[in-house]
Structures are given as structure tokens and as C-alpha cells.
């Protein structure tokens, strides 16, 4: 039996800059029941506060709802582990909520086979930003990637599209079915998961419809 090992806050994420969650690895419990508490302060402020919600995001986590989330302020967060033999405190983690956004994937993915005047066909991929992000006001600047592969292929082909919400893919094989997904990343933030998969078959004898 011994004091607890040093915990480590290993991840903080926000879906929208309005709420966020931090998770910690507990370290060893020293063979004894161990309590964990997360405390935080904000830069330039003297007060220290305890985690407002240990339940919402599951074990070893702290959820900061809207009322506890400030942007443009750096949070200084630590986790303390205590058992009857002693205590141990994590290194402080400095968190700026504007830098930890992991958004939902883009939505409304649409796939359309089109043809140029020279009869060359291409796949026109279009999508919309995730619902929660107010891209128009500049609150979020999103970058996007699409990935596609034929049903038979093992490897995805990835295209970075910058801020564009559409992309044209050329040199696809007629008669093949292609799977397509998109994901997005805000400035300074993290890539979303890949969105819902859509598929389309490239016709063998594509003729342009009026």
C-alpha cells in the first residue's frame, strides 16, 4: 500500500467552443481506494475552482458546461489523487478552448457524376459545414479533406480541399462503385471523425442529361 501515482491530464476537447471536457489517466491507486479531484484557475485570476461536473463525460473526466466555459482565457488545470497514504498532483495543463475544438463531421454529402464538354467524366463531391459551426461569421474557419476508394481497393485516396466545400475527382474507372467520406478541421483544432460514407457507381456509358 502506497500513496497514489501521479495522474496525467491527457486530452481536452470541445465540440463547439461552448463546452469542453478534459480526461485524465489516473496512475496507480497504491492498492487503496483513491479519490480524484480536478481543480482549475484561469490566467490572471487568483481563484481556484473544482470541476463542475464529473459525471457527464464518463469516468476520469470533467465536463465544463456553457456557464463554465470562457474563450480567450487560458485555463490552468490540475488533477489531484488522494488516498489514506497520501496524495499526488498532475502537472498543470494549460488549455485555451479555442484550440481544442473537435467538430462534428461535415453534413449533406452529395455525389454527382458530371461530364465536361470533351466527354471526360468526373465525380463532383459537395458537402456542408457541420451544423454547430457558424462559418459565415468567421467564428470558425474550417478546412476539409475528402477520401474515396473503389469498393475493391484497400487504400483510401485523400484530397485536401482547403476551405472549399466541393471538389472534383477525375480519372475514375467506369463501372466501378466508389465510397466517399469527408472530415473537417477548424483553425488550431482537431480533425473531426470521418463522416457518413456515401457511394456512387461511375456509369460505363455516361451520357450528359439536359
Amino acid at each position: 500500500q502506497s500513496p497514489p501515482g501521479k495522474p496525467e491530464i491527457h486530452k481536452c476537447r470541445s465540440p463547439d467552443k461552448e463546452t469542453f471536457t478534459c480526461w485524465w489517466n489516473p496512475g496507480s491507486d497504491g492498492g487503496l481506494p483513491t479519490n480524484y479531484s480536478l481543480t482549475y484557475s484561469k490566467e490572471g485570476e487568483k481563484n481556484t475552482y473544482e470541476c463542475p461536473d464529473y459525471k457527464t463525460s464518463g469516468p476520469n473526466s470533467c465536463f465544463f458546461s456553457k456557464q463554465y466555459t470562457s474563450i480567450w482565457k487560458i485555463y490552468i488545470i490540475t488533477v489531484n489523487a488522494t488516498n489514506e497514504m497520501g496524495s499526488s498532483t498532475s502537472d498543470p495543463l494549460y488549455v485555451d478552448v479555442t484550440y481544442i475544438v473537435e467538430p462534428e463531421p461535415p453534413r449533406n454529402l452529395t455525389l454527382e457524376v458530371k461530364q465536361l464538354k470533351d466527354k471526360k467524366t468526373y465525380l463532383w463531391v459537395k458537402w456542408l459545414p457541420p451544423t454547430i459551426t457558424d462559418v459565415k461569421t468567421g467564428w470558425f474557419t474550417m478546412e476539409y479533406e475528402i477520401r474515396l476508394k473503389s469498393e475493391e481497393a484497400d487504400e483510401w485516396e485523400i484530397h485536401f480541399t482547403g476551405h472549399q466545400t466541393q471538389f472534383k475527382v477525375f480519372d475514375l474507372y467506369p463501372g466501378q462503385k466508389y465510397l466517399v467520406q469527408t472530415r473537417c478541421k477548424p483553425d488550431h483544432g482537431y480533425w473531426s471523425r470521418w463522416g457518413q460514407e456515401k457511394s456512387i457507381e461511375i456509369p460505363n456509358d455516361f451520357t450528359l442529361k439536359d
Epitope: H10, D91, Y94, I100
Partner: antibody, heavy 120, light 107 residues
Framework: EVQLVQSGAEVKKPGSSVKVSCKAS????????MHWVRQAPGQGLEWIGE????????NYNQKFKDRATLTVDKSTSTAYMELSSLRSEDTAVYYC?????????????WGQGTLVTVSS | DIQMTQSPSSVSASVGDRVTITCKAS??????VAWYQQKPGKSPKLLIY???NRYTGVPSRFSDSGSGTDFTLTISSLQPEDFATYFC?????????FGGGTKVEIK
């Protein structure tokens, strides 16, 4: 205890490449961005670029965009900086530096530095 | 690129002196400024982030004031271990850039 341990000094010929490693320990490697900064003898500090070890997303100083390549090996918690087409003015101490937190780019932990000498 | 101009390039001072180092950004950087201390043959060490916040474990004699384009690092009472070179850095826009450094020497 957080540590960034860099590979040893290198002497290179002009036109060749160098790859410097930075092994991280004492924290979860994928949590923090890693930066590379260099310092020519007796000079100031110059930022080369940064990489997010969680997904290898990187940003570069335009000055180094065509010559520097940042990579990571998550399995060994090691970051790498490769600089190609070396010239004498690339002689410098190269540092890896860990981001101070989940936020802006200030650097709370630094490697011990790797001296790269470019000489014919 | 944003230029960070530090002055003076060197300053001679005695233990107990108040030392002031300034850093001027070529364009607005808000409070996105950090300060580092570097001793010969060693790696830089973070002192201040977000223009005015001392990093964990940094003594209270180090302070910064300023925002926008003009920043000042003050060492209120110089200690023997403070003789070193100090650098400012902006992280407002890419590429992150540093000042040329100010060497604090023993008078």
C-alpha cells in the same frame, strides 16, 4: 518528469540532408504539438515548424517549407526534423520544443539541442 | 512576417538592480507574446506567456506589461542566476518569430 532527448551532433556536406530526432518521455506524446527551432552560432532563435503528433498535421515557416520535413513515430514517442539541400548558413543548434499546453504556441519544454555543422 | 525588435541588445547591471527589456512588434499581436531566458550552452527556458502570465515556478521578480505592439519584461531585483540572454516571441500569426535577444551582463 518531462524530457525531450535529441540525437547527437552532426557534420554534413553542403547539398546533403540531416535528420534530427527528439525522443519524448514523461507525458502522453500525442497530447501536445511539437515545434522545431534553430539557433545559429551567437544568433537569435528561428522557428522552423510544428507538428501535431496525434495526426501528423504540420505547419511550416515558409522559409523552410521546401526543405524541412517534420514527422513523428508514435510507437516510440519520437519526433523528427529532416532538413535537405543543406548550405553553410544552416549551421546551427536545432531544438525540439513542446507546446506549453493545449493552446497557443509558447514552448515550455526544450530538448538539449543538436548542433548541425555544414561544411565542405 | 512579424518582426520582434528587442532593445537594448545588451545591458550591464548589478545584483539587486531593476532591469527593463523592451520588445516591439512590427504589427499588432494582442497579448500573444512569450519571454524566455537562455544561459550559455543551454536551452531556452519559458518565463512568461500571454504577455503577462508567469509560467509555473517562475519567480515573481519577473513580470511583463504591455499589449498590442509594445512589451516590457521587468526583473524587479536582479539575482545572480538572472545573468543570461532574454528573448521575446510572438505567437499571434505564422510564422512564430523571436526577438534578437537581450544579454544581461554583470556590471
Amino acid at each position: 518528469e518531462v524530457q525531450l532527448v535529441q540525437s547527437g551532433a552532426e557534420v554534413k556536406k553542403p547539398g546533403s540532408s540531416v535528420k534530427v530526432s527528439c525522443k519524448a518521455s514523461g507525458y502522453t506524446f500525442t497530447t501536445y504539438w511539437m515545434h522545431w527551432v534553430r539557433q545559429a552560432p551567437g544568433q537569435g532563435l528561428e522557428w522552423i515548424g510544428e507538428i501535431d503528433p496525434s495526426d501528423s498535421y504540420s505547419n511550416y515557416n515558409q522559409k523552410f517549407k521546401d526543405r524541412a520535413t517534420l514527422t513523428v513515430d508514435k510507437s516510440t514517442s519520437t519526433a523528427y526534423m529532416e532538413l535537405s539541400s543543406l548550405r553553410s548558413e544552416d549551421t546551427a543548434v536545432y531544438y525540439c520544443a513542446r507546446n506549453g499546453g493545449l493552446g497557443p504556441a509558447w514552448f515550455s519544454y526544450w530538448g538539449q539541442g543538436t548542433l548541425v555543422t555544414v561544411s565542405s | 512576417d512579424i518582426q520582434m525588435t528587442q532593445s537594448p541588445s545588451s545591458v550591464s547591471a548589478s545584483v539587486g538592480d531593476r532591469v527593463t527589456i523592451t520588445c516591439k512588434a512590427s504589427q499588432y499581436v494582442g497579448t500573444a507574446v512569450a519571454w524566455y531566458q537562455q544561459k550559455p550552452g543551454k536551452s531556452p527556458k519559458l518565463l512568461i506567456y500571454s504577455a503577462s502570465n508567469r509560467y509555473t515556478g517562475v519567480p515573481s521578480r519577473f513580470s511583463d506589461s504591455g499589449s498590442g505592439t509594445d512589451f516590457t519584461l521587468t526583473i524587479s531585483s536582479l539575482q545572480p542566476e538572472d545573468f543570461a540572454t532574454y528573448f521575446c516571441q510572438q505567437y499571434s500569426s505564422y510564422p512564430w518569430t523571436f526577438g534578437g535577444g537581450t544579454k544581461v551582463e554583470i556590471k
